[in-house]
């Protein structure tokens, strides 16, 4: 969370940004809020990126002004125009790429004053893991797969029954480069699993952490998975 203050004469406004992460190959959002101003035509929003000449996006007098926009952002950016009056200056970024990572500045000017705040935008790939029972193996095993990760994550297994146990000796993890030569498919196999136990496959890099749980009983298999972004907020 970064809060910036700006001074305009005697007036300053608070601009707040949140460190956020973009999943490459999807739309992303760079979050920025400011003190609301009901006079939409008096609001100017400028997004800048460190090391880039020209603007990422500009919104003023109630509409986009892309005349100064850098070409790497052409056709890819948008503010949430209907939410500007309530203080939302967040930027939508279409088809996030690795190269979009960096330090951005959200600059605001309103009739109340001006202010800005920086935002660290991380880009990578993260996806939900899926765990399945591998019946083909000589002993019953679990296979945890996640289709897209970058940078290369760590993978760890845990179990409800054997809490604190180290499963590195009875698991095998591989990383297969995907066709676009950036992201990788993660596959981890846990051997010698026992029935009536809950196992967790945890995949983590510096951007996100995902966990897949599986409970295998005689009568059913229950699965659950979750994903959380790290260092955001």
């Amino acid at each position: 969370l970064i809060i910036g203050f700006g001074i305009s004469g005697k007036h300053f406004i608070t601009v707040t940004t949140f460190t956020s992460a973009g999943n490459i190959g999807e739309d992303g959002t760079l979050s920025c809020t400011f003190e609301p101003d009901i006079k939409l035509n008096g609001i100017v929003i400028q997004w800048l990126k460190e090391g880039i000449k020209g603007l990422v996006h500009e919104f003023k007098e109630g509409k986009d002004d892309l005349s100064q926009q850098h070409e790497m952002f052409r056709g890819r950016t948008a503010v949430f125009a209907d939410q500007v009056v309530v203080g939302n200056a967040s930027l939508r970024l279409k088809n996030v790429q690795l190269t979009d990572a960096g330090t951005y500045t959200c600059y605001i000017r309103t009739s109340k004053g001006k202010g800005n705040a920086n935002l660290e935008y991380k880009t990578g790939a993260f996806s939900m893991p899926e765990i399945n029972v591998d019946y083909n193996a000589s002993s019953e095993s679990l296979r945890c797969e996640a289709p897209r990760w970058f940078p290369q994550p760590t993978v760890a297994w845990a179990s409800q029954v054997d809490q604190g146990a180290n499963f590195s000796e009875v698991s095998n993890t591989s990383f297969e480069l995907n066709s676009e030569n950036v992201t990788m498919k993660v596959v981890s196999v846990l051997y010698n699993v026992t029935i009536n136990n809950t196992y967790s496959c945890m995949i983590e890099n510096d951007i996100a952490k995902a966990t897949g749980d599986i409970k295998v009983t005689d009568s059913e298999v229950k699965r659950r998975s979750q994903l959380q972004l790290l260092n955001s907020g």
């Epitope: 490459i24 892309l66 948008a78 503010v79």
Partner: antibody, heavy 115, light 109 residues
């Protein structure tokens, strides 16, 4: 050369199924937003579906539940699986790459749904 | 869902004249996500303008785009015989959803 080539269209009876293919060359399908857009005879363009680089998919309400967009990264090919076909699905189907907009289009493949 | 309405439905002009095509959105559209396409009979659409005003690769400079918010315009400054075709505007929305206008037919007078 950047190119998209569709195939798989044809005459199909109502209720039938069809799989359209779109082979890409000169770029990687999995790095782009890839779309299917259709055009009924004498009508305008209608967006059907998109698959993001991440694999996330979205569909127009008119086809939701009846079509599935997918891709085979090893073949650099986009697909549209169409089920429960109706007469109103009769159209030329185009695949299109979206970078900053739909900048590359295939030549289209014709689907005719009729008994 | 955002609806794009193009006008006029048909525009009859002569080569050498200026053509102005309008695209109106039912709610505000980001300029970045507004594009124009040209389609000739029996052919696939061709991207002309993206980001409301940026010309796509290989598009002659007689084609220009402008506008923001809910009102966008495609202008062809001096019509050439090969410009007579159907023109579509299109937006990338927040559903996410792509929407096309119904098209404007530009015909020879």
């Amino acid at each position: 050369e950047v190119q998209l080539v569709e195939s798989g269209g044809g005459l199909i009876q109502p209720g039938g199924s069809l799989r359209l293919s779109c082979a890409a060359s000169g770029f990687t399908v999995s790095s782009n937003y890839m779309n299917w857009v259709r055009q009924a005879p004498g009508k305008g363009l209608e967006w059907v579906s998109v698959i993001y680089g991440s694999g996330r998919t979205y569909y127009a309400d008119s086809v939701k539940g009846r079509v599935t967009i997918s891709r085979d990264n090893s073949k650099n090919t986009l697909y549209l699986q169409m089920n429960s076909l109706r007469a109103e699905d009769t159209a030329v189907y185009y695949c299109a790459r979206d970078t900053y907009a739909m900048d590359v289009w295939g030549q289209g493949t014709t689907v005719t749904v009729s008994s | 869902e955002i609806v794009l309405t193009q006008s006029p439905g048909t525009l009859s002009l002569s080569p050498g004249e200026r053509a102005t095509l309008s695209c109106r959105a039912s709610q505000s559209v980001s300029s970045s996500y507004l594009a124009w396409y040209q389609q000739k009979p029996g052919q696939a659409p061709r991207l002309l303008i993206y980001g409301a005003s940026s010309r796509a690769t290989g598009i002659p400079d007689r084609f220009s785009g402008s506008g923001s918010g809910t009102d966008f315009t495609l202008t062809i400054s001096r019509l050439e015989p090969e410009d007579f075709a159907v023109y579509y505007c299109q937006q990338y929305g927040s559903s996410p959803m792509y929407t096309f206008g119904q098209g404007t037919k530009l015909e020879i007078k």
